[in-house]
């Protein structure tokens, strides 16, 4: 995943014992917040593993890369990063592992240069539909976001709202069509059982989509047709049993695509014939000779590429009168 990185070698650290002296005065434009490390040369601020409960108010205006990882932020309110003057340079924001369970509408407003956002490893029980779009208008101003990293944001089962987690995430991605410029979307490790059918059609600029380590059983209703720029599609570690003709044709039609299908429990019966034929011909699947049958038991561990149509049978379904109890 693409987290903001820093080339900074020298960070000025704001000593905690100075905090009370500084807070009595108006904040200086380029001071370093308490409990953070700052490098103006690298345009980077790191407030990492500090158990912060809110975003520091006195972030320096020069900040381009902001790490707020390993904190206890809980809630990201509207305008959490709105400042006067605005943080006009902030391009990469990493909030991973900061115990966020709620991100409210407009949380990232007034960040005109924000290109990378990482909210991974936060139990997001309540992600506002307008978290990224900032308004509830049917068409919002385009977001500058190019990379959105949302790996492992599923909350524990007992903390989930009484609604579809997939639906909540997708609503935030699609609201106001604000994310039309998004190029990388990572949604790994979120227990997704399905992918709502309209989501990909409305993210036409995607180059990289990571859906690995979910629980996707089928892609039957998912269309990749519009994603003409898609370069990588990660579907490893799901529960896929077979890919059907429609999906195979759409993937084959994408000019730059590389597809990753490792670690899915492929069912090698008569329904697998089209996929096996396609695998033998296609160049888009990476490591395709690693794909092996998981079921039925008689086919277990066989390499898909080595199957032929005679191997792929389905047990006949007996009429009720012939079935044994």
């Amino acid at each position: 995943s693409s987290s903001p990185t820093s080339s900074a070698s020298s960070f000025s650290s704001s000593a905690p014992f100075l905090a009370s002296a500084v807070s009595a005065q108006p904040p200086l434009p380029d001071q370093c917040p308490a409990l953070c490390e700052c490098s103006e040369a690298a345009r980077t601020v790191k407030c990492v593993n500090r158990n912060l409960t809110e975003v520091p108010t006195d972030l320096p205006a020069y900040v381009r890369n902001l790490f707020l990882t390993g904190n206890q932020l809980a809630v990201l309110p509207a305008g959490a990063f709105a400042r006067r003057p605005p943080l006009a340079e902030l391009a990469a924001l990493n909030l991973s592992g900061s115990r966020l369970d709620e991100v409210r509408a407009g949380a990232f407003e007034h960040l005109p240069s924000l290109r990378q956002l990482d909210l991974s490893h936060n139990p997001l029980a309540d992600l506002s539909p307008f978290a990224f779009s900032g308004s509830n208008a049917s068409v919002s101003a385009p977001s500058p976001l190019v990379e959105l990293i949302l790996n492992h944001i599923v909350p524990p089962e007992d903390e989930r709202q009484n609604r579809s987690f997939e639906g909540m995430v997708v609503a935030a991605l699609l609201a106001g069509r604000a994310l039309q410029g998004l190029r990388r979307l990572e949604l790994a490790s979120n227990h997704f059982l399905y992918l709502p059918r309209d989501v990909l059609a409305q993210l036409p600029s995607l180059r990289h989509l990571d859906l690995s380590n979910n629980s996707l059983v089928s892609l039957t209703y998912v269309s990749f047709r519009n994603l003409t720029h898609l370069e990588s599609l990660h579907l490893e570690d799901n529960a896929l049993k077979v890919l059907h003709n429609g999906t195979l044709a759409e993937l084959q039609g994408l000019p730059h695509i590389r597809v990753f299908l490792d670690n899915n429990p492929w069912v090698c019966d008569c329904h697998m014939a089209d996929m096996v034929t396609w695998l033998k011909e296609t160049e888009v699947v990476q490591g395709k000779d690693r794909l092996t049958c998981a079921y039925p038991e008689k086919m277990r561990n066989r390499v898909l590429l080595e199957l032929n149509s005679a191997d792929l049978d389905c047990d006949p379904i007996l009429p009720p009168s012939l079935q044994t109890s």
Partner: antibody, heavy 116, light 107 residues
Framework: QVQLQQPGTELVKPGASVKLSCKAS????????MHWVKQRPEQGLEWIGN????????NYNERFKSKATLTVDKSSSTAYMQLSSLTSEDSTVYYC?????????WGQGTTLTVSS | QVVLTQSPAIMSASPGEKVTMTCSAS?????IHWYQQRSGTSPKRWIY???KLTSGVPVRFSGSGSGTSFSLTISSMEAEDAATYYC??????????FGGGTKLEIK
């Protein structure tokens, strides 16, 4: 029935190389990956690497990349593992195993002794 | 990569006794497999996909668990069950990893 036949013992000198064999029968050799597993006395199982007999593609455990080389001979349905620059640390039992999600058939193992 | 930890390392049980051993994963896995290795022989796949018995395995064996916690249970210990049992993570891509094993002895 599926069988993986391995020689019972190999004795080699320190610094030399050895090529362990695993002859498969009872199934289509090219349809399954072949794995190699190391087991030191009274210790657990350690995956060394695997090879696709159909095309020769291999994967290795990082720890064995400079120690083991996997090959196959399709005509005789035999998988090989060459171990190089042998030391006493390499003296132990090596198994071949057919697998994918799991290892459904295992050879009897070859006991390698490295001694001058 | 996922680390599998088995406990206990060694245990003993009397004939007829119920036996449970565990396999704990460092992060969530979908399934695990169990292998039985009797002294002086090669391992045999015993249970696969957490709970499915390999053909020929006695029904006194069962497997269960999910996420990071899995177990193998013998409902009534018999002498032939004395062996070392290894768990392995469900995967079809490298690396394949095993637990350290649980050695089961008969009292």
């Amino acid at each position: 029935q599926v069988q993986l036949q391995q020689p019972g013992t190999e004795l080699v000198k320190p610094g030399a190389s050895v090529k362990l064999s695993c002859k498969a029968s009872g199934y289509t050799f090219t349809s399954y990956w072949m794995h190699w597993v190391k087991q030191r006395p009274e210790q657990g199982l350690e995956w060394i690497g695997n090879i696709n007999p159909s095309n020769g593609n291999t994967n290795y455990n990082e720890r064995f990349k400079s120690k083991a080389t996997l090959t196959v001979d399709k005509s005789s349905s035999t998988a090989y593992m060459q171990l190089s620059s042998l030391t006493s640390e390499d003296s132990t039992v090596y198994y071949c195993a057919r697998g994918g999600w799991d290892f459904d058939y295992w050879g009897q193992g070859t006991t390698l002794t490295v001694s001058s | 990569q996922v680390v599998l930890t088995q406990s206990p390392a060694i245990m003993s049980a009397s004939p007829g006794e119920k036996v449970t051993m565990t396999c704990s994963a460092s992060s969530s896995v979908r399934y695990i497999h169990w292998y039985q290795q009797r002294s002086g022989t090669s391992p045999k796949r015993w249970i696969y996909d957490t709970s499915k018995l390999t053909s020929g395995v006695p029904v006194r064996f069962s497997g269960s668990g999910s996420g990071t916690s899995f177990s193998l249970t013998i409902s009534s210990m018999e002498a032939e069950d004395a062996a070392t049992y290894y768990c392995q993570q469900w995967t079809s891509k490298p690396p394949w990893t095993f637990g350290g094993g649980t050695k089961l002895e008969i009292k």
